[in-house]
């Protein structure tokens, strides 16, 4: 069971990143699915290595003082969502913006029907060029 | 099937990084090989988690305006190369240069005879000290 | 065999990071253990994907000129410790400090009784907020 999906620019104002089965994507079988273009949902309980990579372009003057934060989050059936992993990068002083990349990854127990998704502080800063931003998992 | 190889400084002007089976490297068996010091080639079709880490040292004034970009690339038999993953980091203002590290990783389907390699915008900026720059894969 | 442990602030002045089985941690069975809150120790020989993520907050003026370095290290029975992976990030000019995240990961052969741990140049700069700093492994 494995998946690797590709970032998709979205007109939605939500902080949850959108993904697509496009380009050189992976969706090994129907035991993992991409739901609503925003979350990877698994049918089988078990340990999964889950990862995300986010490239973004920001400028210190044009952004809030808070850093750019990417969060890997879990929504289990009947539970509130929770943060599994986070990474933070202070905005660049480069103009018009400076690119930076964040990588998150870890081993987590998922229940049947559990979904994982990626949240960022400012989706408008995310880079969607080939290979820059992606999200996936594999069952151990 | 798994491999982990270590960066090697190269006098070549190519943007493709060079690797070696040295230090604490891994080469599990002959189903994965390091070819020409530049690419990991697999004999078996299947899903692989492929990763690379690149540490580099650059300075904004001494570099081009474009960021430092590391790309994980795929060359399948009878196909042109393609980008699987990219990460970008804007150059530092630190002098003489500021170190930064990039990590790339994802799950991809590889065909028999497929090769993966790492491309960077400026190989002369890559750090080859112990543990700083490495490349590997594992078959799921 | 898999583990994922969560960073713990420590009053110790050691450069070795401290970890805990808290929050959404993973400890699959007793073939991997967290020893002294500082190292993951495995009972079985084999290939392991080992990873760490460290988020830190630093300022160029308040820090030494040397970059922030995170090292993934190995201590095998009867051997001196050795560096497996390192990542470096130059300090930010943001005030009071600028957050940055480092991710390390690779495939390594571990002997029975081998331990892996994470070393940083300045543990006081490490961010311990939810999900920011973690450490884990999985047996292939």
């Amino acid at each position: 069971i494995a998946a690797h999906v590709i970032s998709e620019a979205s007109s939605k104002t939500t902080s949850v990143l959108q993904w697509a089965e496009k380009g050189y994507y992976t969706m090994s079988n129907n035991l993992v699915t991409l739901e609503n273009g925003k979350q990877l949902t698994v049918k089988r309980q078990g340990l999964y290595y889950i990862y995300a990579q986010v490239t973004f372009c920001s400028n210190r003057e044009a952004s809030s003082q808070a850093p750019f934060i990417a969060s890997l989050c879990l929504k289990s059936p009947g539970r509130f969502e929770r943060i599994l992993l986070r990474a933070a990068n202070t905005h660049s002083s480069a103009k018009p913006c400076g690119q930076q990349s964040i990588h998150l990854g870890g081993v987590f127990e998922l229940q049947p029907g559990a979904s994982v998704f990626v949240n960022v502080t400012d989706p408008s800063q995310v880079s969607h060029g080939t290979g820059f931003t992606s999200f996936g998992l594999l069952k151990l | 099937i798994a491999a982990h190889v270590i960066s090697e400084a190269s006098s070549k002007t190519t943007s493709v990084l060079q690797w070696a089976e040295k230090g604490y490297y891994t080469m599990s068996n002959n189903l994965v090989t390091l070819e020409n010091g530049k690419q990991l080639t697999v004999k078996r079709q299947g899903l692989y988690y492929i990763y690379a880490q690149v540490t580099f040292c650059s300075n904004r004034e001494a570099s081009s305006q474009a960021p430092f970009i590391a790309s994980l690339c795929l060359k399948s038999p009878g196909r042109f190369e393609r980008i699987l993953l990219r990460a970008a980091n804007t150059h530092s203002s630190a002098k003489p240069c500021g170190q930064q590290s990039i990590h790339l990783g994802g799950v991809f389907e590889l065909q028999p005879g497929a090769s993966v390699f790492v491309n960077v915008t400026d190989p002369s900026q890559v750090s080859h000290g112990t543990g700083f720059t490495s490349f590997g894969l594992l078959k799921l | 065999i898999a583990a994922h442990v969560i960073s713990e602030a420590s009053s110790k002045t050691t450069s070795v990071l401290q970890w805990a089985e808290k929050g959404y941690y993973t400890m699959s069975n007793n073939l991997v253990t967290l020893e002294n809150g500082k190292q993951l120790t495995v009972k079985r020989q084999g290939l392991y994907y080992i990873y760490a993520q460290v988020t830190f907050c630093s300022n160029r003026e308040a820090s030494s000129q040397a970059p922030f370095i995170a090292s993934l290290c190995l201590k095998s029975p009867g051997r001196f410790e050795r560096i497996l992976l390192r990542a470096a990030n130059t300090h930010s000019s943001a005030k009071p400090c600028g957050q940055q995240s480092i991710h390390l990961g690779g495939v390594f052969e571990l002997q029975p009784g081998a331990s892996v741990f994470v070393n940083v140049t300045d543990p006081s700069q490490v961010s311990h907020g939810t999900g920011f700093t973690s450490f884990g492994l999985l047996k292939l």
Partner: nanobody
Framework: EVQLLESGGGLVQPGGSLRLSCAAS????????MIWVRQAPGKGLEWVSI????????YYADSVKGRFTISRDNSKNTLYLQMNSLRAEDTAVYYC????????????????WGQGTLVTVSS
Amino acid sequence: EVQLLESGGGLVQPGGSLRLSCAASGFTFMEYAMIWVRQAPGKGLEWVSIISPLGLSTYYADSVKGRFTISRDNSKNTLYLQMNSLRAEDTAVYYCAKYQDSSDSQYTNFDYWGQGTLVTVSS
């Protein structure tokens, strides 16, 4: 909308040099191989040179090997053809084209091309 705009053609003496450029837009340039083709007066299309998506592999027709060099700058979405030691038989309209798929063995497999730039080699 895919657009390819060639420039750099002109009149040059035998043995001279020219550098052609092709500015690309409307597609993800770095994902595609690119090709230069030419059409001499009264003749059919002839492929000249191909460059792979990342510029790591180049291919040349026998008639130009050793004299022409293809290159690309993915950061600028631009394709180039450096033409040295030009001969009268190189006189043609030169077109840049976008390769249609990822197979590296079909040298005529292109789907979009520009309006062309005329190269005349004459004394």
